[in-house]
């Protein structure tokens, strides 16, 4: 019998979770045999997007993934796809662990294989799979924001995750809005955080072989209320040709819901200002936008009458802010005409 046929007689392991991503740590030199579900037919293994050949040291053969002796270059993402539908049956990442090196003088390499309990061997205490995603320990977040803490881990048996707040079991039952525990993502999500959410959040990951924990510190910064802030330089002075389309932009930052108006300055009886000292304006557009969105005033097919000063006025419950820009409209024959008139300088104002 050829070696490949001998391997066929060996038991193989179906990865624990169908469709969900799974991470397995394999020792250098260790044989790997993984089945793809309960059937051998119509299943293909892929590594990093390339289908594995049915022969060789690493092969996809009769629905199973076989690695004769695990090498560093074998680490990576493996998918088992069902032929025809091409649905992902298994999504598996194999990592190399130098500390588990199998090849030694006094014992045979253990095979990553199945036992009567169906566990993956070697069994392993929990470990962090993506510690780089846990680098940020200290989180300072404005009130109202969403916070997500992640503790991506693996182990065998598959570990469980529990969350503590300030050392006590945390299920979010006393929190307005509750929490979302996404165990498959090893994450805790809190929406619309408030000052009472401040504290130390600890993920406790454990299986029968051990436990690991990591703590995040969360501080919630109370927002200082302020009138809308308009991005500098917007709206911008614009020059257009008669008949063209123009867009004037206004970017507004506001914690409280902002109310936006576009105004065009007009002249009445030869005057730009009324007796109260305020300019005469025509309201072109009124809108409510979400914070940090761009508000656009569209002017179609502009004519000479559209030239003039335009103002973006933003208000919220705290106050008003506005900034202005000039639109210059050129006749079609004057495409090269560019002059900097005194009034073409942008006017930027802020009012309470």
């Amino acid at each position: 019998l050829e070696a490949s046929e001998e391997m066929e007689q060996e038991p193989c392991l179906a990865p624990i979770l169908e469709q969900q991503e799974q991470v397995l740590t394999v020792a250098l030199g260790q044989p790997v045999r993984l089945c793809c579900g309960r059937t051998e037919r119509g299943r293909h293994w892929y590594k990093e997007g390339s289908r594995l050949a049915s022969a060789g040291r690493v092969r996809g053969w009769r629905g199973r993934l076989e690695i004769a002796s695990f090498l560093p270059e074998d680490a990576g993402r493996y998918l088992c796809l069902a032929r025809g539908s091409m649905t992902v049956v298994h999504n598996l990442t194999l990592l190399m662990d130098d500390s588990l090196t199998s090849i030694s003088n006094d014992e045979d390499p253990k095979t990553l294989s199945s036992s009567s309990s169906g566990h993956v061997y070697p069994q392993q205490a929990p470990y962090w799979t993506h510690p780089q995603r846990m680098e940020k320990k200290l989180h300072a977040v404005p009130a109202g924001n969403t916070v997500k803490f992640r503790c991506p881990a693996a182990g065998n048996p598959m570990p469980t995750i529990h969350w503590l707040k300030d050392g006590q079991a945390f299920h979010g039952e006393n929190r307005i809005g509750g929490i979302r525990l996404r165990h498959q993502h090893w994450s805790l999500v809190m929406e619309s955080v408030v000052p009472s959410d401040r504290g130390t959040y600890t993920c406790l990951v454990e299986n029968s072989l051990g436990s690991i924990r990591y703590s995040y510190l969360l501080d919630v910064l109370e927002r200082s209320p302020h009138r809308p802030i308009l991005q500098a330089g917007l709206p911008a002075n614009t020059t257009a040709v008669v008949g063209s389309d123009v867009e004037l932009l206004c970017k507004v930052y506001s914690d409280a819901q902002p109310h936006i108006q576009w105004l065009k300055h007009v002249v009445i009886n030869g005057s730009s200002f009324g007796a109260d000292g305020f300019p005469y304006v025509q309201v072109l557009k009124t809108t409510d936008i979400n914070s940090s969105e761009v508000e656009v005033l569209y002017l179609r097919n502009v004519s000479a009458e559209d030239a003039g000063e335009y103002t973006c006025l933003a208000g919220n419950s705290i106050g008003l802010s506005y900034q202005s820009a000039w639109l210059t409209v050129l006749p079609e024959e004057d495409l090269t005409w560019t002059t900097a008139t005194p009034e073409a300088a942008s006017h930027h104002h802020h009012h309470h």
Partner: antibody
Framework: EVQLLESGGGLVQPGGSLRLSCAAS????????MGWVRQAPGKGLEWVSV????????DYADSVKGRFTISRDNSKNTLYLQMNSLRAEDTAVYYC???????????WGQGTLVTVSS | QSELTQPPSASGTPGQRVTISCSGG????????AHWYQQLPGTAPKLLIY???QRPSGVPDRFSGSKSGTSASLAISGLRSEDEADYYC???????????FGGGTKLTVLG
């Protein structure tokens, strides 16, 4: 450029009080944990205290608990350390430090010397 | 009494490779990143290595860090006279809710 400038050090008698200040510039002060670390003459670094960004939570080394108070004024970009009931063993250079979100002190002040002696 | 343990001194000749060890417990080194600071004579400490093995900009690649379990180490290769300084390891300590430092290692560059 991040700058931390301590002031307020000096000579004080045992049992006396002193208030250290740390003026921060070159970065947005309010979202950072800030802390004090001290170094006695010829000795190693010792963590003293840390304050959370909002100022609502503070932590102290056992050696100063109950005697020192850390505070901050985010509107003035300033960190403070009020030191009461000073002892000879509090003699040290006191450093103000910005705490990076990963938990290390990524910027330090030049230090201010506090001498407790009769 | 420091929470993290370092050898008080280390030495080497120019061009040599020197390592400094640091050991702690689960609440600090075991469950958080290791960081290293360099303190040149008469100056404030300066961040040398953070997050176990990352170098801030401006730190030469002769300096490297590693961590395993509750122990960390700092390696300095191609030793130079200007490396003569005190080196401190540190880690956040979850039980203290603050950083904890090693006692420091005085590195001497011989002749």
């Amino acid at each position: 450029e991040v700058q931390l400038l301590e002031s307020g050090g000096g000579l004080v008698q045992p049992g006396g009080s002193l208030r250290l200040s740390c003026a921060a510039s070159g970065f947005t002060f309010s979202p950072y944990w800030m802390g004090w670390v001290r170094q006695a003459p010829g000795k190693g670094l010792e963590w003293v205290s840390v304050i959370w960004p909002s100022g609502g939570t503070t932590d102290y080394a056992d050696s100063v608990k109950g005697r020192f108070t850390i505070s901050r004024d985010n509107s003035k970009n300033t960190l403070y350390l009020q030191m009461n009931s000073l002892r000879a063993e509090d003699t040290a250079v006191y450093y103000c430090a910005r705490v990076h979100p990963a938990g290390h002190n990524d910027h330090w002040g030049q230090g201010t010397l506090v001498t407790v002696s009769s | 009494q420091s929470e993290l343990t370092q050898p008080p001194s280390a030495s080497g000749t120019p061009g040599q490779r020197v390592t400094i060890s640091c050991s702690g417990g689960y609440s600090n080194m075991g469950s958080n990143y290791a960081h290293w600071y360099q303190q040149l004579p008469g100056t404030a400490p300066k961040l040398l290595i953070y997050n176990n093995n990352q170098r801030p900009s401006g730190v030469p690649d002769r300096f490297s860090g590693s961590k395993s379990g509750t122990s960390a180490s700092l390696a300095i290769s191609g030793l130079r006279s200007e490396d003569e300084a005190d080196y401190y390891c540190a880690a956040w300590d979850d039980s203290l809710s603050g950083p904890v430092f090693g006692g420091g290692t005085k590195l001497t560059v011989l002749g």
